[in-house]
Amino acid sequence: EEELQVIQPDKSVSVAAGESAILHCTVTSLIPVGPIQWFRGAGPARELIYNQKEGHFPRVTTVSESTKRENMDFSISISNITPADAGTYYCVKFRKGSPDTEFKSGAGTELSVRAKPSAPVVSGPAARATPQHTVSFTCESHGFSPRDITLKWFKNGNELSDFQTNVDPVGESVSYSIHSTAKVVLTREDVHSQVICEVAHVTLQGDPLRGTANLSETIRVPPTLEVTQQPVRAENQVNVTCQVRKFYPQRLQLTWLENGNVSRTETASTVTENKDGTYNWMSWLLVNVSAHRDDVKLTCQVEHDGQPAVSKSHDLKVSAHPKEQGSNTAAENTGSNERGSSDYKDDDDKHHHHHH
């Protein structure tokens, strides 16, 4: 009689996480009598996966009925595979004894687990940045196997090239993580832009996973200011407007100063939105010129999104008015100043010229 051989026909088996893995094993003889055991790994630290003779193995079922006559098939099925199950599995024949002793091992079957990467998470900088600045975005995805993976970056559908990607760990592992950092140059038109991280993996059947970040969370477009004097509304009143254009985000506070003294402060509320996602707003000030003996320097000061204030001034000439109209020597007459603000719809294609 030929000596028993343990046949493991599959050198390797690949299984998707969550599925069952079938590990094939047959013996070539009924002799010697004794049980089959399955181990993961070899040597003294090997892990018992199934013992025909004794033990409780809730995830393991035998493919054939081992009690049946002349059974030589000791293949097993392991349910609900996870990346932690990856490794080399050995089918080992034992010889009956007290205790049973190892008789012969199969050559082993390497089980690899195909695990899907987690949904990519894209995160941007902690603080907003202005156009022309370069900002970094990170993309992370975890838990995938095998290690081979492809990551791409896009901005509004255009592939980016300035990025660095690492897959960890470098050595063998049950599962892997990917971390990538991309550099993006902001433009004034990026309020509606998206940065996309796309991950392709064998487990995704050609349907990559995407993570996105909206540049609206990252960009700050500072406003441009224009202060203009409108035609006289009443004999002694001048309407001065401050047009605040192309800003983002909306958080904005405007202060009027007359000769350096605060006249009024207001917060942008009813704004108009431009096609590019930026906002426009207009505020006006009615100045009673008869209340001023000298020329008035009107300043529109804007604090946008907590940044240092920017301002634009306009010199209001009062010398053209008769002196008696300016007989009120008070430097300011706040009662004469009507508060006002208005929506201002900017033409996106218009060029703005600002005059002091």
């Epitope: 002799i31 004794g34 003779k53 004794e54 081992s66 009690t67 049946k68 006559r69 009956k96």
Partner: antibody, heavy 119, light 110 residues
């Protein structure tokens, strides 16, 4: 270590029934056949029947088919052999034995249960 | 059913001598290249003990003075050098079909 522990001796009257138990330990009960064999005083071995605890498949010696019933309780790893309509010639030691190689052989044996049938 | 006939019914052998017990089946007990014959030893007051399986394979813990041979319908259990502890009744069993036992052979010391 495989162990088969059988229930104690029984004395029965003719026509009665007896149910002998065999509690298994040291192995996975559902993975191996259990055989029942009897031996009358001074006589040879006589195979009664066998049962696969995994699915309760049974094979009976035709001589005992109408009088013997094998069952198992997998929750307690116990096999049972019930013999009905006892006669005096059923007096014997009844053994359970485990088949370790699925060869329909008897690798490990219990110590036996003496059943005496006497009026 | 397959009937097994052992011979002799009893046997007396001197210590250190060879003892041979035969078992003949009423039809072949061979299947898939295996001979489904088993040999057991039973000492007084004890359950039987498996010695040989599939005609010629020594069970674990059995001294190598015991051996089995044969094929088809004729089988032999041999004790190469009889020891005092070998005194017992020996049974052959077949399982080509459902198990049956031979009638037993009583081995004594001469």
């Amino acid at each position: 270590q495989v162990q088969l522990v059988q229930s104690g001796a029984e004395v029965k009257k003719p026509g009665a029934s007896v149910k002998v138990s065999c509690k298994a330990s040291g192995y996975t009960f559902t993975n191996y056949w259990i055989n029942w064999v009897r031996q009358a005083p001074g006589q040879g071995l006589e195979w009664i029947a066998m049962i696969d605890p995994s699915d309760s498949e049974t094979h009976y010696n035709q001589i005992f088919k109408d009088r013997a019933t094998l069952t198992t309780d997998t929750s307690t790893s116990t096999a049972y052999m019930e013999l009905r309509s006892l006669r005096s010639d059923d007096t014997a030691v009844y053994y359970c034995a485990m088949d370790y190689g699925s060869l329909y052989a008897m690798d490990y044996w219990g110590r036996g249960t003496l059943v005496t049938v006497s009026s | 059913d397959i009937v097994l006939t052992q011979s002799p019914d009893s046997l007396a052998v001197s210590l250190g001598e060879r003892a041979t017990i035969n078992c003949r089946a009423s039809k072949s007990v061979s299947s898939s290249g295996y001979n489904y014959i088993f040999w057991y030893q039973q000492k007084p007051g004890q359950p039987p003990k498996l010695l040989i399986y599939l005609a010629s394979n020594l069970d674990s813990g059995v001294p190598d003075r015991f051996s089995g041979s044969g094929s088809g319908t004729d089988f032999t259990l041999t004790i190469s050098s009889l020891q005092a502890e070998d005194v017992a009744v020996y049974y052959c069993q077949e399982s080509r079909e459902l198990p049956t036992f031979g009638q037993g052979t009583k081995l004594e010391i001469k």
